[in-house]
């Protein structure tokens, strides 16, 4: 495995007071392997609400690299290939669980964390507010 | 805490051979709170590729209940509110980390697992295969 410079303040795994702590096996089982999902790899270009993917890296987090979607346009692409501003491209957001090293630099002490990521974009009809 | 009928084969937290195992604090930290509060969207109804949410439950997993997106139509909704089959509604999929009790019924031994979930749908131009 990876050797991490150890923080001298790392909690002791045997410490019965280590808060709300459980053992987690990081030998990640991938439930997706047999399902053969249709990969959504080129949807970001083919969508009427296309998006770009931006890399977000944090070495103290697992997974360290998360790709975030950013919609390319405010509007959506119409049949002529032009941006139609009567519709809106919006990000579909999702919370994901990640593990954060805590305290930092401790090789085998983590905290569960929820972060919000944008997964892709969809085209929606706008909400029009009528001013009285 | 919770009292769980204990599996006699539960691993010993102090066992140095427990594979690739780390201590995880389950006091879930919410990174979103100060920066980006989550907004429960109605995009699943307003999208040109609308979707329904379907319940998937597995009591040995956290989160035990996952609501998955299923696109309502093969095509996309056009400006007249009709389904246009010249375009395709497709699911945007994302891998998420979940925790699985392993061995089952062990109160504080878990395994990380990756599962693929459909988060929402987007409208894409179809790939047309021309037969020679």
């Amino acid at each position: 495995g990876i050797t991490i410079p150890r923080n001298p303040g790392c909690p002791n795994s045997e410490d019965k007071n280590f808060p709300r702590t459980v053992m987690v096996n990081l030998n990640i089982h991938n439930r997706n392997t047999n399902t053969n999902p249709k990969r959504s790899s080129d949807y970001y270009n083919r969508s009427t609400s296309p998006w770009n993917l931006h890399r977000n890296e944090d070495p103290e987090r697992y997974p360290s690299v998360i790709w975030e979607a950013k919609c390319r346009h405010l509007g959506c692409i119409n049949a002529d290939g032009n941006v139609d501003y009567h519709m809106n491209s919006v990000p579909i957001q999702q919370e994901i669980l990640v593990l954060r090293r805590e305290p930092p630099h401790c090789p085998n002490s983590f905290r569960l964390e929820k972060i919000l990521v944008s997964v892709g974009c969809t085209c929606v009809t706008p909400i029009v507010h009528h001013v009285a | 805490g919770i009292t769980i009928p204990r599996n006699p084969g539960c691993p010993n937290s102090e066992d140095k051979n427990f594979p690739r195992t780390v201590m995880v604090n389950l006091n879930i930290h919410n990174r979103n709170t100060n920066t980006n509060p989550k907004r429960s969207s109605d995009y699943y109804n307003r999208s040109t590729s609308p979707w329904n949410l379907h319940r998937n439950e597995d009591p040995e997993r956290y989160p035990s209940v996952i609501w998955e997106a299923k696109c309502r139509h093969l095509g996309c909704i056009n400006a007249d509110g009709n389904v246009d089959y010249h375009m395709n509604s497709v699911p945007i999929q994302q891998e998420i980390l979940v925790l699985r009790r392993e061995p089952p019924h062990c109160p504080n031994s878990f395994r990380l697992e990756k599962i693929l979930v459909s988060v929402g749908c987007t409208c894409v131009t179809p790939i047309v295969h021309h037969v020679a």
Partner: antibody, heavy 126, light 107 residues
């Protein structure tokens, strides 16, 4: 259909403790959490704390920290709330409520209470 | 602690009338705002979760809207059985907090 059935009314003296039970049926007990909310006579709702059954992790409101203990027993699908050092201010109806703990519409949905117990009246009087 | 302030505290309404109750949060809570109905001597019942999504078996006359700090519960055509106290509740941050309640009675 989820149902939460609470233990009966209690009369206690100041300084004593009370333990209220909440028996859950319907759905998988492990899949959700249980929150505890109280309501003093003629007053509003006040959150005391809760437990995530999957992990056995509790959260407490600071006001009750050190005085309240929330536990759950998966074998009997029952959650418990014990409040110690009772005073007349603790006279209230105590409710347990189901916290779905679902991954819903892209989010980890917690602390939105979708089913409630019938309430347990606790009277503290000397 | 996030403070939720409901208005009005009390509303007396005739049947078939439209009722609007507002809930203001002391900070941005996204959409993590829920509404409950409590009838006298009964437990609270979930009406609306996450600002605008109906709880199971809730009549369509109940709807919710809002995001951020300002939220609204609307009862479109009040029925006699809707006489109750309505509470908003935020799940954005611990401690979970509730509004002080709005009592709705029938004229």
């Amino acid at each position: 259909e989820v149902q939460l059935v609470q233990s009966g009314a209690e009369v206690k003296k100041p300084g004593e403790s009370v333990k209220v039970s909440c028996k859950a049926s319907g759905g998988s007990f492990r899949s959700y959490g249980i929150g505890w909310v109280r309501q003093a006579p003629g007053q509003g709702l006040e959150w005391m704390g809760g437990i995530t059954n999957f992990f056995g992790v509790e959260d407490y409101a600071q006001k009750f920290q050190g005085r309240v203990t929330i536990t759950a027993d998966e074998s009997t699908t029952t959650a418990y709330m014990e409040l110690s050092g009772l005073t007349s201010d603790d006279t209230a109806v105590y409710y347990c409520a189901r916290d779905p703990n679902e991954f819903w519409n892209g989010y980890y949905a917690t602390h939105d209470f979708d089913y409630w117990g019938q309430g347990t009246t606790v009277t503290v009087s000397s | 602690e996030i403070v939720l302030t409901q208005s009005p505290d009390f509303q007396s309404v005739t049947p078939k009338e439209k009722v609007t109750i507002t809930c203001r949060a002391s900070q941005d809570i996204g959409s993590e705002l829920h509404w409950y109905q409590q009838k006298p001597d009964q437990s609270p019942k979930l009406l609306i979760k996450y600002a605008s999504h109906s709880g199971s078996g809730v009549p369509s006359r109940f709807s919710g809207s809002g995001s951020g700090t300002d939220f609204t519960l609307t009862i479109n055509s009040l029925e006699a059985e809707d006489a109750a106290t309505y509470y908003c509740h935020q799940s954005y941050n611990l401690p979970i907090t509730f509004g002080q309640g709005t009592k709705v009675d029938i004229k």
